[in-house]
């Protein structure tokens, strides 16, 4: 017996589309090996339709798909614009068709409904609106006019010209008379719910020379969007629900157990907390389209999605709405990142941010995400050169250590750097990652003066203590600019006496300048660093001013300056809007599995104990 | 929350036949599965066949043990789902339960359904 299992029976109409589910055992063989759908032929062979290598027959071209989710041991066949000539005998299976994976399939596909016995045909999407057009006689141009609805062997009134309006109906129904010269009336329905569909019967007159029309009202709930994607990436739902809701409250809905929708988005200001920080409602366009990206992708986060439009900002009968159902990939091509990482006031995190390694050339981004309103990322700095105004000089995004990874380093740590940040490219839309900074008690491990004043044409030497802790790492110096820090000479001066408990493993690196030009003006680094990996750093600002006296500084901690006031916001603030991080490419090439080799140990800030998924920003 | 009920168990001979009916209650039968599973004494439940469907397109599954003689139906005017049972053997003896799911994407063969009635038995003599 086949351990391939499906529908054995699937009945549909013309025009309609069918969504085939074959299941299989979720073996890794299994899981990688080539799916089919093939056509049984009278002879007994089985000729391929579709397969997941990417064949698709001349009669599937442009109406049929066939996606594998390895992880659920399952894979889904949709076919859409069906006619009667698909109806037949059909096989789902695995590998080679001749051998026995497989499963029978009988498709039928019958005549869609037509004009039969003179009765029009309404097919309108869930939360629409129907325009039910009734002709009639001029003999009856006077005479009352009504709508009737069939319910079981009894027509039930649902509207007429006197003004009467079922209470099943009551605020989105309207009954039109046309102009004197059409012999035509129409009844408007908005909003309309499942329990509207049904055989519809229009009148005009009472009595035996009344005109009477039929129509069937056919109400369809929307077929989910199958939406695959990995673990710790990012989604984006596009929702276009026309420009009669444009002005109405949109959200992006959940479903739990039964018919309910936990919000998780929505235009009035409500968000799911377990969206915080990953969730992005993109404005919307005038035709009352808009999209909502969700970033750092969870297991839970699998599911049935709804977005739609009501005054509420959620689910309500007749809310027109578009529906999703989203995997996520646990085989994820995204490497794990830590997904908090901790800092101390006055010091500095390293945030590894991982990108799509086949795409290396990519601009790399990096922002703060904001939860005001529907959320919204403004940019804080780029790969090529931009750095927002006030972020110079404790902000740099460095292409290191590269094939799939990039480094952002954020130092002079105040508590209004807690939040969350998200890493991204211009690229493959489906890399967005998130990543929450927390600043914790404790003091900075790096110790350097705060600013310092520089004598032009004479000599400075700035000082680094590095504790014990750093003994292995590469100590530098370098001088931030937009494009990154460029290193520059420091010398080891020995054992720094500026820790308490350290012992001679401590040391004390110097920057020197020489002869002091306006050039060397601007912020200085010192870090630690294993190979191109990235732990703290630490920022000193060096203003250079006229000689007053000769003679060489040699800037120690105690006769540092206060460091400089935060800049203020500039008007080049850059923000992610629509256009800027939207691609509609749900599904991605297939990726290339990422590096996910760990760090050396203390390469970056430290991981957590408490957390796999946190990392601190002082190293052990 | 949809109360689901089953009728129609009895006993019945062996190549006779019957029809289970699982009417929903609570509100409309919208669910997009309905499946049926059966108890027998001793052993454990196991899927009989499902119906889904979704707007005017409807899919059938069969156990095995069952294809060819167990035909599912859902019948709209009466908010049901039928299933009628030709060819009984003794082996079908068993309790009779239907479950509802919302899910379109779970196995119908799975026990994640959302709503279980309380069973009707089915008893085959020989």
């Known amino acids: 017996k086949s351990p391939i299992f499906g529908p054995e029976e699937v009945n549909s109409v013309e025009g309609n589309s069918v969504s085939i589910t074959c299941y299989y055992p979720p073996t890794s063989v299994n899981r990688h090996t080539r799916k089919y759908w093939c056509r049984q032929g009278a002879r007994g062979g089985c000729i391929t339709l579709i397969s997941s290598e990417g064949y698709v027959s001349s009669k599937y071209a442009g109406r049929a798909n066939l996606t594998n989710f390895p992880e659920n041991g399952t894979f889904v066949v949709n076919i859409a614009q069906l006619s009667q000539d698909d109806s037949g005998r059909y096989k789902c299976g695995l590998g080679i068709n001749s051998r026995g994976l497989s499963f029978d399939v009988s498709l039928e596909v019958s005549q869609g409904p037509g004009l039969l016995n003179d009765t029009k045909v309404y097919t309108v999407d869930l939360g629409r609106t129907v325009t039910i057009n009734c002709p009639f006689k001029t003999e009856n141009a006077q005479k009352r006019k009504s709508l009737y609805k069939q319910i079981g062997l009894y027509p039930v009134l649902v509207i007429d010209s006197s003004g009467y309006v079922n209470p099943n109906y009551t605020g989105r129904i309207r009954l039109d008379i046309q102009g004197t010269g059409q012999l035509l009336f129409s009844v408007v329905i908005n909003q309309l719910r499942l329990s509207d569909a049904g055989q519809y019967l229009c009148q005009a007159g009472d009595d035996s020379n009344s005109n009477k029309k039929n129509a069937d009202l056919q109400v369809l709930k929307p077929e989910p969007e199958l939406v695959y994607e990995d673990l710790r990436g990012s989604v984006t739902f596009h929702c276009a629900l026309g420009p009669e809701v444009a002005n109405v409250a949109k959200f992006l809905c959940r479903q739990s157990s039964g018919e309910n929708c936990d919000v998780v988005v929505n235009t009035l200001g409500k968000r799911a907390p377990a969206f915080e920080g990953r969730i992005l409602l993109n404005p919307q366009d005038k035709d009352g389209s808009f999209s909502v990206v969700i970033t750092g992708l969870r297991k839970e986060d699998a599911g049935r999605y709804l977005c739609g439009a009501h005054s509420d900002g959620q689910l309500q009968e007749g809310s027109p709405i578009q529906a999703w159902q989203l995997f996520v990939n646990e085989e994820s091509t995204i490497p794990r990142s830590p997904t908090v990482v901790k800092g101390v006031a006055g010091g500095s995190v390293a945030v590894l941010c991982p990108y799509n390694r086949k795409e290396s050339k990519s601009i790399k981004y990096w922002c703060l995400w904001e939860g005001a309103q529907n959320g919204r990322c403004p940019l804080l700095v780029d790969s090529e050169g931009w750095v927002k105004a006030q972020y110079e000089g404790r902000l740099s995004l460095l292409e290191e250590p590269g094939n799939g990874t990039f480094t952002v380093i954020l130092n002079q740590l105040t508590s209004r750097d807690a939040g969350f940040y998200w890493c991204l490219t211009n690229g493959d839309t489906l890399w967005r990652t998130t990543v929450e900074i927390k600043i914790i008690e404790g003091e900075p491990n790096l110790k350097v003066p705060g600013n310092v004043t520089a004598v032009l044409g004479e000599t400075l030497k700035v000082p680094c203590h590095f504790p014990c802790k750093f003994s292995s790492y590469e100590k530098y110096w370098c001088k931030w600019n937009n494009t990154g820090c460029q290193a520059l000479p420091s010398q080891d001066e020995g054992p720094s006496k500026a820790f308490v408990n350290c012992d001679e493993n401590s040391r004390l690196v110097s920057l020197t300048l020489n002869l002091v030009t306006r050039a060397d003006e601007g912020w200085y680094w010192c870090g630690v660093k294993q190979g191109h990996f990235y732990g703290e750093t630490a920022a000193v600002y060096v203003a250079v001013e006229e000689r007053k006296a000769a003679g060489s500084r040699d800037v120690s901690l105690a006769k540092a300056d206060a460091a400089p006031d935060e800049k203020v916001l500039d008007s080049g603030f850059r923000e992610i809007e629509n256009k800027a991080i939207q691609d509609p490419r749900l599904f991605a090439e297939e990726k290339a599995v990422a590096d996910t080799r760990d760090q050396a140990d203390g390469s970056r800030a430290s991981v957590d104990s408490g957390s796999s998924e946190e990392q601190g920003g002082s190293s052990r | 929350e949809v109360q689901l009920v089953e009728s129609g168990g009895g006993l019945v001979q062996s190549g006779g036949s019957l029809r289970l009916s699982c009417a929903a209650s609570?509100?409309?039968?919208?669910?997009?599965?309905v499946g049926w599973f059966r108890q027998a004494p001793g052993k454990e439940r196991e899927f009989v066949t499902a119906?889904?469907?979704?707007?005017?397109?409807?899919?059938?599954y069969y156990a095995d043990s069952v294809k060819g003689r167990f035909t599912i139906s859902r019948d709209n005017a009466r908010n049901t789902v039928d299933l009628q049972m030709n060819s009984l053997k003794p082996e079908d003896s068993a309790v009779y339960y239907c479950?509802?799911?919302?899910?379109?994407?779970?196995?119908?063969?799975?026990?994640?359904?959302?709503?279980w009635g309380q069973g009707t038995l089915v008893t085959v003599s020989s």
């Open positions: 479950a509802g799911q919302m899910s379109q994407w779970s196995d119908p063969r799975g026990d994640d359904y959302d709503s």
């Open positions: 609570g509100r409309t039968f919208d669910q997009f599965t």
């Open positions: 119906i889904r469907w979704s707007g005017s397109t409807t899919y059938r």
